[in-house]
């Protein structure tokens, strides 16, 4: 049950959550596994139970405190272990010395809203959620707009190489329904990755004025 190819990946949301995914080909779905966190300079130890998310994949969240509390810093090291029950004992399946700020994945941006919409333009703003004050302005964003008849995968990516929590979309078609998403990434960390995409924001451009050239 434990001899398949395995992978253990964790990310810190920069505040009070470490999310982990453990995958193991050939493992039994009812195998009982957990992630144990052992920090080098904190008084707490933390454990979460890995719960199935797919056929051979389990996930859990180590919740370290209140969502906006700064529980770890750039100098912290947290040893993370996957422990799986084998009969009466626990076996270490994976181990890593986790540097939180080398392994960042922020929460998806929230509070997307249309600030102003015209026939060919739309100004949209958003907020970042549970992001550490350590980043100051060292964040970047990617955005995408879903046009009628296309898929999200076909949408071109717009890159904002600075902490800019708004965008002005141009060259839009009048009286057309669009959807918009954005994601965020700190510049820090060798294994840092993009946040999930935000919830899509639906908006409609204004119709062209009758009798006017569009």
């Amino acid at each position: 049950a434990v001899n398949g190819t395995s992978q253990f990946t964790c990310f810190y949301n920069s505040r009070a959550n470490i999310s982990c995914v453990w995958s193991q080909d050939g493992a039994l779905q009812d195998t009982s596994c957990q992630v144990h966190a052992w920090p080098d300079r904190r008084r707490w130890n933390q454990t979460c139970e890995l719960l199935p998310v797919s056929q051979a994949s389990w996930a859990c969240n180590l919740i370290l405190g209140a969502p906006d509390s700064q529980k770890l810093t750039t100098v912290d090291i947290v040893t993370l272990r996957v422990l799986c029950r084998e009969g009466v004992r626990w076996r270490v399946m994976a181990i890593q010395d986790f540097k939180p700020f080398e392994n960042l994945r922020l929460m998806a941006p929230i509070s997307l809203q249309v600030v102003h919409v015209e026939t060919h333009r739309c100004n949209i703003s958003w907020e970042i959620s549970q992001a550490s004050h350590y980043f100051e302005r060292h964040l970047e964003f990617e955005a995408r707009t879903l046009s009628p008849g296309h898929t999200w995968e076909e949408a071109p990516l717009l890159t904002l190489k600075q902490k800019q929590e708004w965008i002005c979309l141009e060259t839009l078609t009048p009286d057309t329904q669009y959807e918009f998403q954005v994601r965020v990434k700190p510049l820090q960390g060798e294994f840092t990755t993009w946040s999930p995409w935000s919830q899509p924001l639906a908006f409609r451009t204004k119709p062209a004025a009758l009798g006017k050239d569009t």
Partner: nanobody
Amino acid sequence: QLQLVESGGGLVQPGGSLELSCAASGFTFSNYAMSWVRQAPGKGLEWVSSITGFGRGTDYADSVKGRFTISRDNAKNTLYLQMNSLKPEDTAVYYCARYSSSTYYPPTPARGRDYRGQGTQVTVSS
């Protein structure tokens, strides 16, 4: 570019000791788990020991447990293997190897290594 350079090998009598070193460069050393593997004459690669990025987790093959100690100095970008009570069957070329991430998997310690050095010869003989 990424480099791993082993040193410290040599000829030693049974029961003797050696310390192997591995100087790493071209990557952020502390972000990666590391290991030692060896290859005896005419044999395949054998895993010896692994260590996490900051040395808080270590593992050993049964054949060396209690005799060998793996350690690292991240300030010097160096991995070590202290070998005591050496036996003729420890004779091999010893290689330092990097895992592809900060994680290693104790049940399958050979998996996930992406680079290794050129090796250093250890001969245990009277």
